[in-house]
Interface confidence: low
């Protein structure tokens, strides 16, 4: 018995061939011997089966002795043994129809679980293997689950259903809703304007929701909400903003925030959350602000950084075009009795300068100048 696999919603063509290469009488029946379709001369006739409006044949092939049964918009319950009766012969074809669907929605938040459910006819025992866009394989039976979806899981998932040594392939497009970056860090000198950007890693026609930026300043004992906003069809409107600092927010995507001045009391970590309409859970992006200040107080030249710096970062003080006077994996360095000239404070990571602040030290009878 020939086995043919079909996909729910697709069209399948079951073949039936006579030895005579001419149009002769044929019938297609199901396993209950109910006639589906056949011919009467050059006319197509249909029986009382449930397939009535979805069954068809190709009259153009009859003259060649080919009498296919075409079933459109396949349903799982179309799985059956179909019998073609032609020339006193019976050709049997077993059709197995499978469906593969993603749980509830194909747009899922980062960190959520994806469950793929296989619909299969009774009595079948298929195996399923799915490959994610990043090349990860998962295998299973009736259901397959992937926990903790990541941004790289966005794209086309290719799933192969295997039954009776035959396979049928499904492609499911999954969109993982996330920010492009899980976290970002901004390095600024004291007094500079700070730009925070939160680009999304997906595009949708309409985007509606609400968001908030909570900020934990390094110097503060608790976090506070800096701004709350609404998102309606990709338009941003601010609901509430603190007085200190007074953030400004762009009206269009990508989400964009401006802090007028980088000050040591603002250095720290923020968490922007975005709740999307009709989605449970929230998108998160962490943002960090590191602020540098270089000062000269009497005979002491000091460079300090505030905010979440890593222990591998190096803080240095050097006189322009000279070797560093002091270089430590610390958040503050200083030089006593600095000689006159342009001093540079550098925060670097493996030789790459992340932040630089210059301070001019005048001869001892003058006052320092900060460029």
């Amino acid at each position: 018995k020939k086995v043919v696999l079909g996909k729910k919603g697709d069209t399948v063509e079951l073949t039936c061939t006579a030895s005579q290469k001419k149009s002769i009488q044929f019938h297609w029946k199901n396993s209950n011997q109910i006639k589906i379709l056949g011919n009467q001369g050059s006319f197509l006739t249909k029986g009382p089966s449930k397939l009535n409006d979805r069954a068809d044949s190709r009259r153009s092939l009859w003259d060649q002795g080919n009498f296919p049964l075409i079933i459109k918009n396949l349903k799982i319950e179309d799985s059956d043994t179909y019998i073609c009766e032609v020339e006193d012969q019976k050709e049997e074809v077993q059709l197995l129809v499978f469906g593969l669907t993603a749980n509830s929605d194909t747009h899922l938040l980062q960190g959520q679980s994806l469950t793929l459910t296989l619909e299969s006819p009774p009595g079948s025992s298929p195996s399923v293997q799915c490959r994610s866009p990043r090349g990860k394989n998962i295998q299973g039976g009736k259901t397959l689950s992937v926990s903790q979806l990541e941004l790289q899981d966005s794209g086309t998932w290719t799933c192969t259903v295997l039954q009776n040594q035959k396979k049928v392939e499904f492609k499911i497009d999954i969109v993982v809703l996330a920010f492009q970056k899980a976290s970002s860090i901004v390095y600024k000198k004291e007094g500079e304007q700070v730009e925070f950007s939160f680009p999304l890693a997906f595009t949708v026609e309409k985007l509606t929701g609400s968001g908030e930026l909570w900020w934990q300043a390094e110097r503060a004992s608790s976090s506070k909400s800096w701004i709350t906003f609404d998102l309606k069809n990709k338009e941003v409107s601010v609901k509430r903003v603190t007085q200190d600092p007074k953030l400004q927010m762009g009206k269009k995507l990508p989400l964009h925030l401006t802090l007028p001045q980088a000050l040591p009391q603002y250095a720290g970590s923020g968490n922007l959350t975005l709740a999307l309409e009709a989605k449970t859970g929230k998108l998160h992006q962490e943002v960090n602000l590191v602020v540098m200040r270089a000062t000269q107080l009497q005979k002491n030249l000091t460079c300090e950084v505030w905010g979440p710096t890593s222990p591998k970062l190096m803080l240095s003080l050097k006189l322009e075009n000279k070797e560093a006077k002091v270089s430590k994996r610390e958040k503050a360095v200083w030089v006593l009795n600095p000689e006159a000239g342009m001093w540079q404070c550098l925060l670097s990571d493996s030789g790459q300068v992340l932040l630089e602040s210059n301070i001019k030290v005048l001869p001892t009878w003058s006052t320092p100048v900060q460029p």
């Epitope: 866009p133 090349g135 394989n137 290719t158």
Partner: antibody, heavy 119, light 113 residues
């Protein structure tokens, strides 16, 4: 399961470039990420980078950044690895490898291509 | 990059005896998302590409004899050949694939005593 067949041995002069091919057959090419791993004579294995058959995205090891280029030709299910500015220490067997069992645990390997850099 | 260190560099074992190879990663390769150790073991014979023996630290690749087993978690892993056969003479490598770039140990040569 996919099979990987690589191009033949190459002899190159220092400073030149070499382009090694790896043809995939027997599987859905777009489903696989193909990595390149090299092995200098008598030495261990060193990962150079990968290219996605699905979208052509690449990820190179820091050491080879700027010298290696990985490309793909979906019409022939072939990936290419080009290494430029060759030096004698690039003499090695270059393998393409892929994974069917788990990410980057390579259960599918090409037969290897010997690249000799000599003046 | 995660550094993988194997010990010993070479090992001579009598036929039928147990061979044990250790592998240490410079940081944990245990993923909390999948609760799996992203560690593989390979066998390489002269003139051949490496052959995958074990993945997820302890899952045997299909067709690999059950005398090969992998164990360990986090940063410390072991490949055990319970009863060494002549055809097991080869170089064995561990590899982490938890963090890009994937990195290999320096290899352990297994010979017959």
């Amino acid at each position: 399961q996919v099979q990987l067949v690589q191009s033949g041995a190459e002899v190159k002069k220092p400073g030149a470039s070499v382009k090694v091919s790896c043809k995939a057959s027997g599987g859905t090419f777009s489903s696989y990420a193909i990595s390149w791993v090299r092995q200098a004579p008598g030495q261990g294995l060193e990962w150079m980078g990968w290219i996605s058959g699905y979208n052509g995205n690449t990820n190179y090891a820091q050491k080879f950044q700027g010298r290696v280029t990985m490309t793909r030709d979906t019409s022939t299910s072939t990936v290419y690895m080009e290494l430029s500015s060759l030096r004698s220490e690039d003499t090695a067997v270059y393998y393409c490898a892929s994974s069917d069992v788990s990410p980057d645990a390579f259960d599918i390997w090409g037969q290897g291509t010997t690249v000799t850099v000599s003046s | 990059d995660i550094v993988m260190t194997q010990s010993p560099d070479s090992l001579a074992v009598s036929l039928g005896e147990r061979a044990t190879i250790n592998c240490k990663s410079s940081q944990s390769v245990l993923s909390s998302s999948y609760n799996k150790n992203f560690l593989a073991w390979y066998q390489q014979k002269p003139g051949q590409p490496p052959k995958l023996l074990i993945y997820w630290a302890s899952t045997r690749e299909s067709g690999v004899p059950d005398r090969f087993s992998g164990s360990g978690s986090g940063t410390d892993f072991t490949l055990t050949i319970s009863s060494l056969q002549a055809e097991d003479v080869a170089v064995y490598y561990c590899q982490q694939y938890y963090s890009a770039p994937p990195t290999f140990g320096q290899g352990t040569k297994v010979e017959i005593k």
